[in-house]
């Protein structure tokens, strides 16, 4: 058993049929010595008396808010949460496996630039009685500071019969140099509590590996005389690290119809303009990627051909 | 020491081209190592990230773009700062800083070259003959060093009398390649920045 926060404790349980469970001793936070009784949640049934209560925690029915009273007055609370371990593996029931970039990916993180600011998000099908708390650091043995905000519900989607909820959090490394060469990864730890179930999820990464630039901005087309070709130009996104001659991007320019199966024109360039063949009912799209370290491509920025 | 002329010519000497070749060569070599040594811990997640140039060179600091010198976090470990008379920079100071930057890059290359050659000598003794360093990568290191045009004491190639532990050597190769790739990215950024200046 360990303390998650004041008056909230996590009991770690091996979860299998007829498991013996964990013996837990609760102590009432009071100078009083006698006349103390214990109850669980909203029940008035007295579970025991005395300054300490010893319980055998085996299942969710044994978890919850234990309260010690004296003469109708509440003295203190202890909330017990369960953390299940099945076949030596901690449960991951609360969050959905996003399976990208690999299986067992519960947290996904992205950074728009090298400033040390990043966003992580996760998915769940649970809509109520759910809380998250996020901590982060650079390295684990001698951690350096990363400050994370509160996790917020950022999107709701309908997937078949189920509703899916996306939560996200923004974090900022306290003293980040965009040009630094990372040797220690960023660690992100998310504590998830659903009713009386506790789970924790972690992710470890280098900022350079989670870079995903914003799409290029100000796409403009200039038809070329006596030709089917158009010159398309664009600018670096505002959120990208500066100077751009140091933090350079490379671009992919594509002309395609509405369907992905349609034919296309595609060209890669390090410049902020390119010449492509425009077709009726097609769109010109441009996306960006770090020129020197191949992490993710940005989303597409698009303009219609006509 | 013979410092290069520190005003970038229109093509930033041939260094930009060579640095691009360097990044390509080390990326290819790292990819090859990951594939060939698939049963060794050779991915970014599995290895310890060590920098053999730590405390010996200061490439990131010496080559910091002017625009980032206002960022306190970037100046932590700088012995020499760009900043003179507020944020103004005298051209002589620029020349000096650029020479310092390029000589730091040269020292990095020299250190990695020695390490890679020593390692290759060990790998050539491996009866499994599983992996060797790409001669192209070694050649590209050499070409960039020549383009940088510094003279410095030659570092003797380390020789070891004991029987090499090939497993450890291959893991060290992965560590070196990962670190060298990150440094090659920095070098490429620097050359691109200098070329545009």
């Amino acid at each position: 058993i360990w303390e998650l926060k004041k008056d909230v404790y996590v009991v770690e349980l091996d979860w299998y049929p007829d498991a013996p469970g964990e013996m837990v001793v609760l102590t009432c936070d009071t100078p009083e010595e006698d006349g103390i009784t214990w109850t669980l949640d909203q029940s008035s049934e007295v579970l025991g008396s005395g300054k300490t209560l010893t319980i055998q925690v085996k299942e969710f029915g044994d978890a919850g808010q234990y309260t010690c009273h004296k003469g109708g007055e509440v003295l203190s609370h202890s909330l017990l949460l369960l953390h299940k371990k099945e076949d030596g593996i901690w449960s991951t029931d609360i969050l959905k496996d996003q399976k990208e970039p690999k299986n067992k990916t519960f947290l996904r993180c992205e950074a728009k630039n090298y400033s040390g600011r990043f966003t992580c998000w996760w998915l769940t099908t649970i809509s109520t009685d759910l809380t998250f708390s996020v901590k982060s650091s650079r390295g684990s043995s001698d951690p350096q500071g990363v400050t994370c905000g509160a996790a917020t519900l950022s999107a709701e989607r309908v997937r078949g019969d189920n509703k899916e909820y996306e939560y996200s959090v923004e974090c900022q490394e306290d003293s980040a140099c965009p040009a630094a060469e990372e040797s220690l990864p960023i660690e992100v730890m998310v504590d998830a509590v659903h009713k009386l179930k506790y789970e924790n999820y972690t992710s470890s990464f280098f900022i350079r590996d989670i870079i995903k630039p914003d799409p290029p901005k100000n796409l403009q087309l200039k038809p070329l005389k006596n030709s089917r070709q158009v010159e398309v130009s664009w600018e670096y996104p505002d959120t990208w690290s500066t100077p751009h001659s140091y933090f350079s991007l490379t671009f992919c320019v594509q002309v395609q119809g509405k369907s992905k199966r349609e034919k296309k024109d595609r060209v890669f360039t390090d410049k902020t303009s390119a010449t492509v063949i425009c077709r009726k009912n097609a769109s010109i799209s441009v996306r960006a990627q770090d020129r020197y370290y191949s992490s993710s491509w940005s989303e597409w920025a698009s303009v219609p051909c006509s | 020491r013979n410092l290069p002329v520190a005003t970038p010519d229109p093509g930033m000497f041939p260094c930009l081209h060579h640095s691009q070749n360097l990044l390509r060569a080390v990326s290819n070599m790292l990819q090859k190592a990951r594939q060939t040594l698939e049963f060794y811990p050779c991915t970014s997640e599995e290895i310890d990230h060590e920098d053999i140039t730590k405390d010996k060179t200061s490439t990131v600091e010496a080559c910091l773009p002017l625009e980032l010198t206002k960022n306190e976090s970037c100046l932590n470990s700088r012995e020499t700062s760009f900043i003179t008379n507020g944020s103004c920079l005298a051209s002589r100071k620029t020349s000096f800083m650029m020479a310092l930057c390029l000589s730091s890059i040269y020292e990095d290359l020299k250190m990695y070259q020695v390490e890679f050659k020593t390692m290759n000598a060990k790998l050539l003794m491996d009866p499994k003959r599983q992996i060797f360093l790409d001669q192209n990568m070694l050649a590209v290191i050499d070409e960039l060093m020549q383009a940088l045009n510094f003279n410095s004491e030659t570092v003797p190639q380390k020789s070891s009398l004991e029987e090499p532990d090939f497993y450890k050597t291959k893991i060290k190769l992965c560590i070196l390649l990962h670190a060298f790739r990150i440094r090659a990215v920095t070098i490429d950024r620097v050359m691109s920045y200098l070329n545009a200046s």
Epitope: D265, V267, F268, I277, R279, K280 | -
Partner: antibody, heavy 118, light 107 residues
């Protein structure tokens, strides 16, 4: 299976015009760009131009501009290359090639040998 | 027009050898470079697109790299069926242009 089948060999006199065909099968003809590339004996490859069968848009290499015409007939899924004012240097194997992407060649015809000789 | 220069023009190698062919563009073409294999009397066959992207059905011993002006095609362990002529082609701008070819011959 995506396939391009070209017409047979041709022998032409200098100054004449040749028209060779390229019949597509195994895909929707207008879904792919169609190119023509030639190869002189013991020489390299030379791109001549492309057509978008969907709308008839064409682009030619400047070297052949004014002498070459590329057409496509969507009713028969066939592309054509017409080269006029033939000279001996035009002796080559002419290939049609197709792709959903405009700028490289995924599927090739078997080639048509055109010999220009007096 | 963008000129593409391949080297060497021919190379003699044995089965099992590692062969590298290079292609240089007269100006920077990013990764807009494709490789083809051609056997005598046959049409060319696409091997690699956009400098390093593999093509389904092409053996993994063929790999490409490069960007800007310098590119290479590597055949990792040469097989008897790999003796052929190899061409690079730029798609950065029209007109599309090919390298002069590299003939891989049996030593």
């Amino acid at each position: 299976e995506v396939q391009l089948v070209q017409s047979g060999a041709e022998v032409k006199k200098p100054g004449a015009t040749v028209k060779i065909s390229c019949k597509a099968s195994g895909y929707t003809f207008s879904d792919y760009y169609l190119h023509w590339v030639r190869q002189a004996p013991e020489k390299g490859l030379e791109w001549m131009g492309w057509i978008d069968p969907e709308n008839g848009d064409t682009e030619y290499a400047p070297k052949f501009q004014g002498r070459v015409t590329i057409t496509a007939d969507t009713s028969t899924d066939t592309g054509y290359l017409e080269l006029s004012s033939l000279r001996s240097e035009d002796t080559a194997v002419y290939y049609c090639a197709a792709n959903k992407e405009l700028r490289y060649f995924d599927v090739w015809g078997q080639g048509t040998l055109v010999t220009v000789s007096s | 027009d963008i000129q593409m220069t391949q080297s060497p023009s021919s190379v003699s190698a044995s089965v099992g050898d590692r062969v590298t062919i290079t292609c240089r563009a007269s100006q920077s073409i990013s990764i807009n470079l494709h490789w083809y294999q051609q056997k005598p009397g046959k049409a060319p066959k696409l091997l690699i697109k956009f400098a390093s992207q593999s093509i389904s059905g092409v053996p993994s011993r063929f790999s490409g790299s490069g960007s800007g002006t310098d590119f290479s095609l590597t055949i990792n362990s040469l097989q008897p069926e790999d003796f052929a002529t190899y061409y690079c082609q730029q798609s950065n701008s029209f007109p599309l242009t090919f390298g002069g070819g590299t003939k891989v011959e049996i030593k």
